[in-house]
Each structure stands twice: as C-alpha cells, then as structure tokens.
Interface confidence: low
C-alpha cells in the first residue's frame, strides 16, 4: 500500500489532523522534501547573524555573518570575530602575529614562515607577520656575485608581541 | 545516544590544580563546539569556557582568563580543563556540555563537583 | 556582555499558567533558551531559538522573546514543574550567558 502522505510536495505537509491532505506550510516554516509530515521552523538570522537567504517554503533560511564576524560551522553555525592580517584571535582578543609567524588573513592562527633551507633554498623575501617569507633558488644556483637576501637575525621585530 | 561523562573533581587545597575531563560518545565529537558550565552550591549557572572542534580556538569566562585551559582530544572524545591556581569561589560542580543554541541539540554531562578548601 | 535579570521566584497553583521573564538590553535581537534544572541534576533544555520547542518537552512549555524581555510560559502548571528556571541569551557569538535563575513553586 503506498504512503497517502508521499504525494504531498516540498513546501507542503501531510496533515493527519485533515485527513491526510496536503496542507501548505504554514508561515516561518518550510519542507524541502515531498512526504513530510510536518514542516521544519525556518531559521532566524539574528544576533551577528544576518540573512544571506530568505526562508521559503520549500528551503530553509541561511545565514552568514555582519561585517567584523566571518561563519564558523556546517551552515554558520557561529560567528567568529575578525582579526586584522597579522594577528590571531586567542582567549584575550586579536594579538599580532609573534616574530617567525605570519597570517594573510582575517581568520585562523598565525603560522610559521616557510623554513627554506629546507627545501634547499634561500630567503629572497624576508616574512613579516602578514606574509610568509619568499623562498628564492638555492645559492649554488645562484650566478658568480649574485646573493641573496640574508635572513633576519633570531630579533623580535618592533611591533611583535609575544604570545 | 549522545552521553557526555565528566571526572576528576574533588577536594583541592587554594592555589592548587586539578585537571577535569568529559568523556563523549554518541556523537562524532570533532564536529562540535565543546563548553564547559559550572555552578557554586545554591547558585545559578554560569558559563566558563568553550573550545572549537579542532581544538584550535579556546574562549574563556573573564572570571577563570588566565587560569584555566580548556583542551580536547578528539582521538579520544574527551574534552579537559585544566584548572590552576584554584580559589574558593571556583567551588561549584562543573558541567560538559554541548551547547547548540540555535538548533535542537544541547545536552549536558551530569556534573562533577570540585571543591576548594582549605 | 548582556545582563539577564530574572525573578528569584515564581509561584503558581496547579493547572494555571506560570510566565517567567528574562530581561537584558535589547534581548529580543538575540536568541534565548530555557533550561528546566530539578534539585540534584543537570539542566534540560525546554526552550531553545526563543519559541522552539526539544522533542519530548511537553506543548504547556512556550517562549517568546521581544524588546527586552524573553518569556517562558508554562500553561497548566503541573506538581512535575517545579524547578529552577535559567534563560541563556546567544547572539550568534562564541561565549554564552545565563540568567540568575528562577524557582517555580507549585503551590
């Protein structure tokens, strides 16, 4: 016997309290699937949520965060405050990058300079606390009276805080 | 079903540590947000502390900002706070929770009490 | 962060209506829950997103959430309700509050 209910369309639901007709949805609520037996509460964007897409009846509300938060979360579930490139948001607010570490973006953690000599190679461009470092060729490619930039000394930069 | 088991409380002299931990199951314990709420004997709820999934970014009451560290093992499911310099009026009995706010699905661990005397 | 004030206490006579409020500066562009908390146990979530309501909570449980007063409304209270109730206002952000608590007296 087939389910009466699996005729009702996404933005409808089977009402049971009408005999199984297929009731729209009522306001503030949606059904994305066909069959449904009730329809889900669309989802409020408030707070430093804002709305990046209308409820309907068929598709649930999302939303993204107001300008200074950026989504953290399957969905956006939270929001997270911005920091500026050069620093990292920790348990006492956005801090600046320490020496050695950079980060190019308004979000995550501060990350090590690229080591070059690792890789053979040399530091062309030195790293600051919004960019990694630029690794050039390594010096026995380097032609006779070329050189490279030389890497900064193990100081603390001005304007580093320790962590 | 989600089932969320703290441990560690006890008797602890001012200025000691001790170390909490919640053990989780029912769940996949990486995708969530991981919250730790206490409450002092006849008072209300106050909230302490949250830790991202990966562990990357922690968050803190200003009440416990500098002594406390909330961390988590997602290897394990467990979830930990590692209390130091403990004071009498952080007596309370602390809860796990997963905390969802907006959506259907905040439970709480039963509580493990910690109290601080000397 | 936002105050919540609730009232200590709330009593109310078996099957009427108990309202619980929770005001904080403009907590109505903010989402709040409601946890129901029963001497000895955790918290139990009876409200969350204002006015929804968990899977298991009884239909007597509402809330609704504007200006600055959230609301928890529990019509035909029963002897099984009293409690400690607790509002929690979130605005999206990472760190939670919590309200001072109210004690439902069924008298």
């Known amino acids: 016997l087939q389910d009466p209910c699996s005729k009702c369309p996404a933005g409808t639901f089977c009402d049971n309290n009408r005999n199984q007709i297929c009731s729209p949805c009522p306001p503030n609520s949606f059904s994305s699937t066909s069959g449904q037996k009730a329809c889900d509460i669309c989802r409020q964007c408030k707070g430093v949520f804002r709305t990046r897409k209308e409820c309907s009846s068929t598709s649930n509300a999302e939303c993204d965060c107001t300008p200074g938060f950026h989504c953290l979360g399957a969905g956006c579930s939270m929001c997270e405050q911005d920091c500026k490139q050069g620093q990292e948001l920790t348990k006492k607010g956005c801090k600046d990058c320490c020496f050695g570490t950079f980060n190019d973006q308004k979000r995550g953690i501060c990350r090590p300079w690229t080591n070059c000599s690792l890789d053979g190679k040399s530091v062309l461009v030195n790293g600051t606390k919004e960019r990694d470092v630029v690794c050039g060729p390594s010096p026995a490619d380097l032609s006779p009276g070329a050189s490279s930039v030389t890497p900064p000394a193990p100081a603390r930069e001005p304007g580093h805080s320790p962590q | 079903q989600v089932q969320l088991v703290e441990s560690g409380g006890g008797l602890v002299q001012p200025g000691g540590s001790l170390r909490l931990s919640c053990a989780a199951s029912?769940?996949?314990?990486?995708?969530?947000?991981m919250h730790w709420v206490r409450q002092a004997p006849g008072k209300g709820l106050e909230w302490v502390s949250v830790?991202?999934?990966?562990?990357?970014?922690?968050y803190y009451a200003d009440s416990v900002k500098g002594r406390f560290t909330i961390s988590r093992d997602n290897s394990k499911n467990t979830l930990y706070l590692q209390m130091n310099s403990l004071r009498a009026e952080d007596t309370a009995v602390y809860y796990c929770?997963?905390?969802?706010?907006?959506?259907?699905?905040?439970?709480w661990g039963q509580g493990t009490l910690v109290t601080v005397s000397s | 962060d936002i105050e919540l004030t609730q009232p200590p206490s709330v009593s109310v006579a078996p099957g009427q209506t108990a309202r619980i409020s929770c005001s904080g500066d403009n907590i109505g562009s903010k989402y709040v829950s409601w946890y129901q908390q029963k001497p000895g146990q955790a918290p139990v979530l009876v409200i969350y997103s204002d006015s929804e309501r968990p899977s298991g909570i009884p239909e007597r449980f509402s809330g609704s959430n504007s200006g600055n007063t959230a609301t928890l409304t529990i019509s035909g209270t029963q002897a099984e309700d009293e409690a400690d109730y607790y509002c929690?206002?979130?605005?999206?952000?990472?760190?939670?509050?919590f309200g001072g608590g109210t004690k439902l007296t069924v008298l």
């Open positions: 929770a997963r905390l969802y706010a907006q959506f259907e699905g905040d439970f």
């Open positions: 830790i991202s999934g990966s562990g990357s970014n922690t």
């Open positions: 929690q206002s979130w605005d999206g952000s990472i760190s939670r509050v």
């Open positions: 029912g769940f996949t314990f990486s995708d969530y947000y």
